[in-house]
């Protein structure tokens, strides 16, 4: 006899885990025989797809390789034609071992921003997401939190928070880990301890001091008066991310200091800034303090001008006076570059001999300065023009540094050769007599303001600077 | 930080050349005087040679005046030692040394670790 | 030819006060010798004390003191310490004819 379609073993739900097998069973009592048809939510399952296995007359389905996707309702639909259609539907719950499907990956953060660590994993059931940072849990607080998608948020990022970390994934089929990342916290340039501002004497040594810190550690650069430092030496040396440098300097003139440090995040730089005044006590104190000693002089630029074996003296109001005399005269001889041939060499000998003054040893030892006519010898005859031109420089605050000042003695203010031959010295490099000077142009209107002495006269006509030392 | 470090130390015939060259960095090479300074195994230093800071003049122990030369490249912040006619007893390690100012003469005020010369056959 | 002469060797007790001699074997040291001075530990490269008879160099311990006595230099070691024990040169600048620069034979100093 007939008989309508019955479904004797309704569908249940199946787990099944990702890449295995799974069958749902459609067991139907009916005559005829009926036909059973399959859905997947409701959307029919073709005979011929090959991921699929229908048999035993369409009541067995088997999903041959189980797919994250295959997930869903399935039902079987059996009809004969006598009564009725029936069905019967069940779930497939694709069970799936726990994966990461967009793990974290290396971070570089600035201090006090928000950091993100990527973790989206994959399961079911859904897996539960930590983090360990180092080789112990991470726990969560105020700042830290574990999002409900698995990444991790730090607010306010701070230094301590640098460091390894990695992602767990885990439910009840099993765990994976994310690969270690590393999370860098830098920081902007920060200077812990700014230089100080000094008031020193001329030719003092004065070292300007600066500690900064950040990360990656900065590098620290001096800046005097707007411009790369030109002189100098600097000392650095960098202990636990702080870096400290000591710039030392031979002080000729005042000047502002600055010390900045600088670090690079990406493509962008931070820096920090600090700076400090040298300025220069009493300006013509060198020169009017007669403290100091006497010495062979033994440096340089005045080796041509001043006698082999001369005794000049040497100002202890400088730090290290001999340095300074002889930066004073090399800073003024380069001066002297650009003027006339005439003027020169003259010039270069008032210079040698006025800051490297030839010294009367004693009890005190005393400076012996230049008689004023041959000062005046230089000033109003060969370097007339030269002197109007500092002059007017002077006035209108031309030069780079005072240190000129203290190179140029004031003619008027020094000794007569007439009042005390033994109390001033004499130039023994003009070497000229009252018929050289006749062939030189006059350089300027006025006549000048005292007798030219007779100098030591020289075999040559002209005028020439001459190594060999002679004392009227 | 100022650092001197030489280099062209070595073994060498007596009657052979050997030319030292000692590289600065951490101050401005120009403005300083250099000198080469050295000391013999279980001796004493010994002054050998002594250059200002613009290079213009140079000055050497008598010992070695003819054989020795100093020289110094500014644009390459380098002081050098041209040693030539070696004989044994210029053996020693050779210092290069830093003047506290431009001044040839001034103190040494900062040394290198030494390159040694061993002049010997 | 004249020699820079130093005492072979000196010793000290911690805290004591000690004054090392420079001198040259004909004739006096003069500021015109700008003497300096250098301690030397064994191995070590040399380090400057003292520049142009008494200033002292940057980062020098005011222990170390630098004069002239009568005709010669002298460096003075007050309260000394157990890493004062080493090696110390004088250097004088000299002139005669030509510029030279001499170190003293060293002095070898012991902190008992």
């Known amino acids: 006899l007939p008989k309508a379609p019955v479904i004797t073993t309704p569908l249940e739900t199946v787990d099944a885990l990702v890449e295995e097998v799974a069958t749902f069973m459609c067991a139907v009592e009916s005559y005829p025989q009926p036909e059973i048809s399959w859905t997947r939510n409701k959307i029919l399952i073709k005979l011929f797809d090959t991921r699929y296995s229908i048999r035993e007359n369409g009541q067995l389905l088997t999903i041959l390789s189980v797919e994250d996707s295959d997930d869903g309702i399935y039902c079987c639909t059996a009809n004969n034609g006598v009564g009725g259609a029936v069905e019967s539907c069940g779930a497939l719950q694709v069970k799936m071992k726990p994966k990461i499907t967009r793990p974290p990956i290396n971070v570089k953060i600035i201090e006090g921003l928000k950091a993100v660590l990527p973790c989206t994993t994959m399961g079911n059931p859904k897996p539960s997401v930590s983090w360990i940072k180092g080789d112990s849990p991470l726990r969560e607080n105020s700042r830290i939190a574990v999002l409900e998608s698995g990444s991790l948020r730090i607010h306010n990022v701070q230094k301590e928070d640098a460091g390894q970390y990695r992602c767990v994934a885990k439910n009840s089929l099993g765990t994976a880990y994310s690969k270690v990342v590393k999370l860098e916290v830098e920081v902007f340039a920060r200077i812990l301890r700014a230089p100080e501002s000094h008031n020193v004497t001329f030719g003092s040594f004065v070292t300007l001091h600066c500690t900064a810190t950040g990360i990656p550690v900065p590098t620290i650069t001096w800046i005097e008066n707007g411009n790369a430092v030109s002189s100098g030496s600097i000392q650095e040396s960098v202990k636990d991310r702080v870096i400290d440098s000591r710039l030392q300097l031979f002080i000729t003139k005042p000047g502002l200091y600055t010390c900045i440090a600088t670090n690079k995040h990406g493509e962008k730089f931070s820096t920090a800034k600090a700076a400090a005044t040298i300025s220069i006590a009493e300006w013509s104190k060198p020169q009017k303090d007669n403290k100091g000693y006497c010495a062979q002089y033994r440096g340089e630029v005045c080796n041509a001008v001043l006698a082999k074996d001369a005794l000049v003296f040497l100002n202890t109001s400088y730090a290290d006076p001999e340095e300074a005399q002889e930066l004073l005269v090399h800073t003024a001889w380069n001066e002297l570059k650009v003027v006339s041939p005439v003027c020169r060499p003259a010039a270069e000998a008032l210079l040698c001999n006025h800051i490297f003054q030839e010294c009367s040893p004693g009890v005190v030892p005393t400076p012996i300065p230049i008689c004023r006519e041959y000062c005046l010898a230089v000033k109003e005859l060969f370097c007339a023009k030269e002197w109007l031109v500092m002059e007017e420089k002077t006035h209108r605050g031309l030069y780079r540094s005072e240190m000129h000042l203290l190179s140029v003695p004031e003619c008027s203010k020094l000794p007569s050769m007439h009042w005390d031959p033994t109390a001033c010295a004499r130039l023994p490099h003009l070497d000229y007599n009252k018929e050289n000077l006749k062939t030189f142009p006059p350089m300027t209107s006025s006549k000048p303001s005292v007798d030219i002495p007779n100098l030591p006269s020289s075999s040559s006509s002209s005028f020439s600077v001459s190594p060999t030392y002679s004392m009227t | 930080e100022v650092q001197l470090l030489e280099s062209g130390g070595g073994l060498v015939q007596p009657g052979g050349s050997l030319r030292l060259s000692c590289a600065a960095s951490?101050?401005?090479?120009?403005?300083?005087?250099m000198s080469w300074v050295r000391q013999a195994p279980g001796k004493g230093l010994e002054w050998v040679s002594a250059?200002?800071?613009?290079?213009?003049?140079?000055y050497y122990k008598e010992s070695v005046k003819g054989r020795f030369t100093i020289s110094r490249d500014n644009s390459k912040n380098t002081l050098y030692l041209q040693m030539n006619s070696l004989r044994a007893e210029d053996t020693a390690v050779y210092y290069c040394?830093?003047?506290?100012?431009?001044?040839?003469?001034?103190?040494?005020?900062?040394w290198g670790q030494g390159t040694l010369v061993t002049v010997s056959s | 030819q004249t020699v820079v002469t130093q005492e072979p060797s000196f010793s000290v007790s911690p805290g004591g006060t000690v004054t090392l001699t420079c001198g040259l074997s004909?004739?006096?040291?003069?500021?015109?010798?700008?003497p300096d001075w250098y301690q030397q530990t064994p191995g070590q490269a040399p380090r400057t004390l003292i520049y142009?008879?008494?200033s002292r160099h940057s980062g020098v311990p005011d222990r170390f003191s630098g004069s002239i006595l009568g005709n010669k230099a002298a460096l003075t070691i007050t309260g000394a310490q157990a890493d004062d024990e080493s090696d110390y040169y004088c250097?004088?600048?000299?002139?005669?004819?030509?510029?030279?620069?001499?170190f003293g034979g060293g002095t070898k100093l012991t902190v008992l």
């Open positions: 250097g004088l600048y000299m002139y005669s004819g030509s510029k030279n620069y001499v």
């Open positions: 142009s008879t008494d």
């Open positions: 250059i200002p800071g613009s290079g213009g003049s140079t």
């Open positions: 951490g101050f401005t090479f120009s403005d300083y005087g």
């Open positions: 040394a830093k003047r506290s100012g431009r001044i040839a003469f001034g103190a040494l005020d900062a």
């Open positions: 004909s004739g006096s040291v003069t500021s015109s010798n700008y």
